[in-house]
Interface confidence: medium
């Protein structure tokens, strides 16, 4: 027979039929089925099928009238070429039917990973996503949704390169993997999270630095007088996208909510397009980028704002230790500290004697006085960019007291 073999696909563990078109009234002498390596089965009318290969026992059957070959519990080893030799009664010529059997595994859910991000001109980003299915190598076709003009597929569809600006909508991309027996789709991937600093290092207005207080609200200014007439404003921070579209309330992408699942703490003012954050958290600190968009979704201008966040300082604690008291001179070491102050706290002591020694960011003070002199009353003031807090140290009865104390 000159025609190409019939291609049949089966699922690993499933069943498959290699069909023969033998009509009921055809008088058959016998049918021999030959497998990828050797003869498999012999069938004759009104007789039991003879199976010749051990590995097919219990998995192979030949249908009564059409003599089609049925294989169940398919293994990867079953794949290959099959041939049916059909011998009709009173018919000298043997008819042959050829088949090619492919056995495929059911696909698992495709995984999408970000391969690379390249920042290009005009504040745009080229993001390369890769789609793969665990355990599947051959015969897997990949496709992506949405199929956009500015997204290109390569490597048989498994790689998608998307070009986008912050002004483009952050669409969810879905990878669909397909083989002849199954089709699976990935979870949606928002590419906006991979491109949150396009062109930020090059150009745009160098915005100001804004100082905020932990737990309190803050406004990051954009100072767009005609904010209401702006098509769209997008603020980017880390993997968060906060946007305000014309004639619409400002919306925070689900990504922003991932930082605070209980409350939407971030929004864009419809008055001046500034970014407002309530109840500041330490992780809100960092560089923010604002992009003003045109109707055609291109970036018309960009501003950077750096947000610094500090705690309101609690009252400092003063600890002291007596170094030694002799010759009528009292010598002590003082240390001033603020709980949760962090490394941005500055300490000052007042009034400071000429011979006093201050060390370690001014938190430590060595001081001495004669018993004939007035006992110094010292004040430690802790300060950071958003607050100041003081504590007075009373030195009387120190030299006659215990070796260490806290005030």
């Amino acid at each position: 027979k000159d025609s190409a073999p019939t291609v049949v696909s089966g699922i690993l563990g499933g069943s498959v039929t290699l069909p023969l078109n033998i009509s009921v009234d055809t008088e058959i002498e016998n049918v021999i089925w030959i497998g990828p390596k050797n003869a498999l089965a012999f069938a004759r009318p009104k007789e039991n099928v003879t199976i010749m290969v051990k590995s097919y026992l219990g998995r192979l059957d030949i249908t009564k009238w059409s003599y089609s070959l049925c294989i169940s519990n398919l293994t990867l080893n079953d794949a290959g070429s099959y041939k049916a030799q059909i011998n009709q009664r009173n018919f000298e010529v043997t008819t042959e039917e050829e088949f090619t059997l492919f056995v495929y595994e059911q696909l698992q859910e495709p995984q999408v990973t970000m391969k690379s991000v390249k920042v290009s001109e005009n504040f745009s980003c080229n993001i390369t996503l890769m789609c793969s299915v665990k355990g599947a190598e051959k015969s897997v076709l990949y496709s992506w949704t949405p199929r956009e003009p500015h997204a290109s597929e390569s490597n048989g569809g498994s790689i998608l390169t998307v070009s986008r600006t912050p002004c483009d909508p952050d669409l969810p991309y879905i990878c669909t993997a397909q083989n002849p027996v199954s089709q699976r789709s990935s979870l949606p991937v928002h590419v906006g999270q991979f491109c949150t600093d396009p062109g930020a290092s090059r150009g745009g207005t160098t915005g100001e630095t804004v100082v905020g207080v932990l737990g309190e609200p803050v406004t990051l200014p954009l100072a767009l007088p005609a904010c209401r007439d702006t098509e769209k404003v997008v603020w980017l921070f880390n993997t968060s996208i906060i946007s305000k579209e014309r004639e619409e309330a400002a919306t925070a992408d689900p990504l922003i909510k991932s930082r605070d699942p209980y409350k939407n703490r971030v929004w864009v003012s419809s008055q001046d397009c500034s970014l407002k954050i309530s109840q500041l958290k330490i992780e809100d600190a960092g560089p923010y980028h604002a992009y003003v968009c045109s109707e055609a979704s291109s970036v018309t201008s960009m501003t950077h704002v750096t947000l610094l966040i500090y705690r309101r300082l609690r009252k400092p604690k003063i600890t002291w230790s007596l170094r030694h008291s002799e010759d009528g001179i009292c010598r002590i070491s003082l240390t001033c500290s603020v709980e949760d102050g962090g490394n941005t706290v500055m300490y000052t002591w007042t009034p400071l004697q000429k011979e006093a020694v201050v060390s370690q960011g001014e938190s430590h003070l060595n001081v001495s006085w004669r018993s004939s002199e007035n006992h110094p009353n010292l004040t430690c003031t802790a300060s950071n960019p958003v607050s100041r807090s003081s504590h007075q140290f009373l030195s009387e009865n120190i030299c006659s007291g215990p070796e260490r104390n806290t005030k």
Epitope: E109, T145, P146, P188
Partner: antibody, heavy 116, light 106 residues
Framework: QMQLQESGPELVKPGASVKISCKAS????????INWVQQRPGQGLEWIGW????????YYSEKFKAKATLTVDKSSSTAYMLLSSLTSEDSAVYFC?????????WGQGTTLTVSS | QIVLTQSPAIMSASPGEKVTVTCSAS?????MFWYQQKPGFSPRLLIY???NLASGVPVRFSGSGSGTSYSLTISRMEAEDAATYYC?????????FGGGTKLEIK
């Protein structure tokens, strides 16, 4: 046999809500996105949104964000669409359809009539 | 969103006649999909990825096009082809459909 079976016709009053169901069979329900499409009388087709049964994640067309809520029950392989604050404008046939990129299988449609 | 405009809106053809339905997109799309819908029934996928025939669709149907211009062709019209045909894109969100072309038999 791959099938999407939708719930029967609904007659509801303006202002009310309605929940339409779409029961899937013949394939692994959690592996495929379920989309919903509206067809108003004598009109064309309009996409409402999708839900991914495995995770429950959803995506809505801007037009239907405030109108439709999509959910699934994995145990019964059923997708649901809740339509709220109904007006006569919502009278239509609603189809569920499987797929991403295109819709390879469709439900038979549920006719919703909103009338006082 | 991308607007798909189909033409003609209504047309009739004799059995055996060649039929072409066009779909014009307001912005470039990468692929077009075509559906057939008969009265009282749900749509049926005919063509996917611009030119690939869906399972069970007769070979007299074909699709072509690129960019903003796409078409569906029936090489020889048959009585069972009388229906409304819709084009659809998913190159950008939201997915959109054309307004439909109603094809009648003469």
């Amino acid at each position: 046999q791959m099938q999407l079976q939708e719930s029967g016709p609904e007659l509801v009053k303006p202002g009310a809500s309605v929940k339409i169901s779409c029961k899937a069979s013949g394939y692994t329900f959690t592996h495929y996105y379920i989309n919903w499409v509206q067809q108003r009388p004598g009109q064309g087709l309009e996409w409402i949104g999708w839900i991914f049964p495995e995770s429950g994640s959803t995506y809505y067309s801007e037009k239907f964000k405030a109108k439709a809520t999509l959910t699934v029950d994995k145990s019964s392989s059923t997708a649901y669409m809740l339509l709220s604050s109904l007006t006569s404008e919502d009278s239509a046939v609603y189809f569920c359809a499987r797929g991403t990129g295109f819709f390879d299988y469709w439900g038979q449609g549920t006719t919703l009539t909103v009338s006082s | 969103q991308i607007v798909l405009t189909q033409s003609p809106a209504i047309m009739s053809a004799s059995p055996g006649e060649k039929v072409t339905v066009t779909c014009s997109a307001s912005s470039s799309v990468s692929y077009m999909f075509w559906y057939q819908q008969k009265p009282g029934f749900s749509p049926r996928l005919l063509i996917y990825d611009t030119s690939n025939l869906a399972s069970g669709v007769p070979v007299r149907f074909s699709g072509s096009g690129s960019g903003t211009s796409y078409s569906l062709t029936i090489s020889r019209m048959e009585a069972e082809d009388a229906a409304t045909y819709y084009c659809q894109q998913w190159s950008s969100y939201p997915p959109t459909f054309g307004g439909g072309t109603k094809l009648e038999i003469k």
